[in-house]
């Protein structure tokens, strides 16, 4: 996260850290009591590593009481999702088992209703990703607040020139942004999961390349599916 | 840019042995598993063996045509995959082709091939 | 051992045409982890193959939207929707689920 600032401790009991090999590679949020959100992209550089997904986290380094590593079961990445484009950049990871719930760990509610968020609201972005150009990673979990951003607007041919489909939305990127390491988080809107921070190479924290998530709501029938 | 290449496919008689390897560059070889499949002259693909990262202990799998006659092996620091094909025979005799397997474990990335021979 | 069985071997067809390509496993091909690793593979001639599906259905880096693949279970399909003159060589599916990993016999797709 750019230009954020260190989140309150376990107050986003719905964040993941996917992990390979024990070290953090993508953000997720616990949509299920058995299943992580994230992005497609994430695990396409895992090759044969371990994938799991650490939950009840604030620091990725030090003993929590609420933190659990668990095993991942199975990796299911939206079917039309290529490696490619940043299209459809969804996946969904089944824990080896439910999670424990408690104050540190909560599904968080996904957006169902299939309606633009409208421009200029504040959403939540969250993340273990960069915090600096230089590649710095935090050790505690990062946040930041960004208004999302017209589809027209992030459209623009000096923005990102009509690659922004209808299953995809923007926030605005002026040196607070999503980052590296920060694929896969969620934006959550008036408390509620809207977004997905999509995992291509994107430039981080310049006004003129906002930052690019998948409406979750747009998926709604997908998700369904592969939870039920 | 993300290449295989093999080499040490050549003539060989029955009974004989021979050693393929492959030579790995443009990607972080220590992380993937990797497999070799093969094609007989004018035939199908085969799948040979596979074997996978340290992370996962270096397990090795084998096809059964092949099972306690090849070894599979692999030098990291060198990013070198190996085949020892031992007691060989002539239904080895195929073009050998080294192959990268992803996270899917779909398999990417495949070099150009070496050809074995097993005749007399 | 997985019995992987394609038909048909051979596909003439007119470019611009639809194309199908079935394969039929043996026996069920969905990994204990739920993931059905079932690929398509393209083989030109003279060249190494390429992947063009994978987990039945996601279409691999650079691979046209007129290849798609679908089925469950023990029955799969490539479709190819209008047939290009670079679509021609010959396709394979290959199971990754159990070991032995198996392709098929391939279907070789030619100008009619």
């Known amino acids: 996260i750019l230009g954020g600032r260190e989140a309150e401790a376990h107050a986003r009991p719905y964040m993941a850290s996917v992990q390979v090999n024990g070290e953090h590679l993508c953000g997720g949020v616990l949509v299920a009591e058995q299943w992580v959100l994230s992005a497609a992209h994430c695990l396409e550089d895992a090759a044969d590593g371990k994938v799991q997904v650490l939950l009840g986290a604030h620091s990725l380094s030090q003993p929590e009481p609420s933190k659990r590593l668990y095993d991942v079961l199975r990796a299911v990445p939206h079917p039309d999702s290529r490696p490619d484009t940043i299209d459809h950049d969804l996946l969904l990871l089944q824990l080896s088992e439910k999670a424990t719930l408690g104050p540190a760990v909560r599904p968080l509610p996904w957006q169902r209703v299939d309606r633009d968020v409208e421009p200029g609201t504040l959403c939540d972005v969250a993340g273990w990703g960069i915090v600096s150009h230089a590649g710095r990673r935090p050790d505690r979990l990062q946040h930041v607040l960004l208004p999302v951003l017209d589809r027209a607007t992030c459209n623009r041919r000096t923005h990102h020139d009509g690659a922004i489909t209808q299953r995809m939305m923007c926030a605005e990127s002026n040196r607070r942004d999503s980052c590296k390491g920060d694929s896969g988080g969620p934006l959550v809107c008036g408390g509620v999961l809207e977004g997905v921070v999509t995992s291509g190479s994107r430039v981080c924290g310049n006004r003129k390349k906002p930052g690019i998530y998948t409406r979750v709501a747009s998926y709604a029938a997908w998700i369904d599916s592969v939870l039920a | 840019a993300v290449q295989l290449v093999e080499s040490g496919g050549g003539l060989v008689q029955p009974k004989g042995s021979l050693k393929l390897s492959c030579a790995a560059s443009g990607f972080s070889f220590n992380t993937y598993a990797m497999n070799w499949v093969r094609q007989a002259p004018g035939k199908g693909l085969e799948w040979v063996a596979r074997i996978r990262s340290k992370s996962n202990n270096y397990a090795t799998y084998y096809a059964d045509s092949v099972k306690d006659r090849f070894t599979l092996s692999r030098d990291d620091s060198e990013s070198m995959l190996y085949l020892q094909m031992n007691n060989l025979k002539t239904e080895d005799t195929a073009m050998y082709y080294c192959?990268?397997?992803?996270?899917?474990?779909?398999?990417?990335?495949w070099g150009t091939g070496t050809t074995v021979t097993v005749s007399s | 051992d997985v019995l992987m069985t394609q038909t048909p071997l051979s596909l003439p067809v007119s470019l611009g045409d639809q194309a199908s390509i079935s394969c039929r496993s043996s026996q069920t091909i969905v990994h204990s982890n739920g993931n059905t690793y079932l690929e398509w593979y393209l083989q030109k001639s003279g060249q190494s193959p390429k992947l063009l599906i994978y987990?039945?259905?996601n279409r691999f880096s650079g691979v046209p939207d007129r290849f798609r693949g679908s089925g469950s279970g023990t029955d799969f399909t490539l479709k190819i929707s209008r047939v290009e003159a670079e679509d021609l060589g010959v396709y394979y599916c290959f199971q990754g689920s159990h070991v032995p990993y198996t392709f098929g016999s391939g279907t070789k797709l030619e100008i009619k």
């Open positions: 192959v990268r397997q992803g996270f899917y474990w779909y398999f990417d990335v």
């Open positions: 987990n039945v259905s």
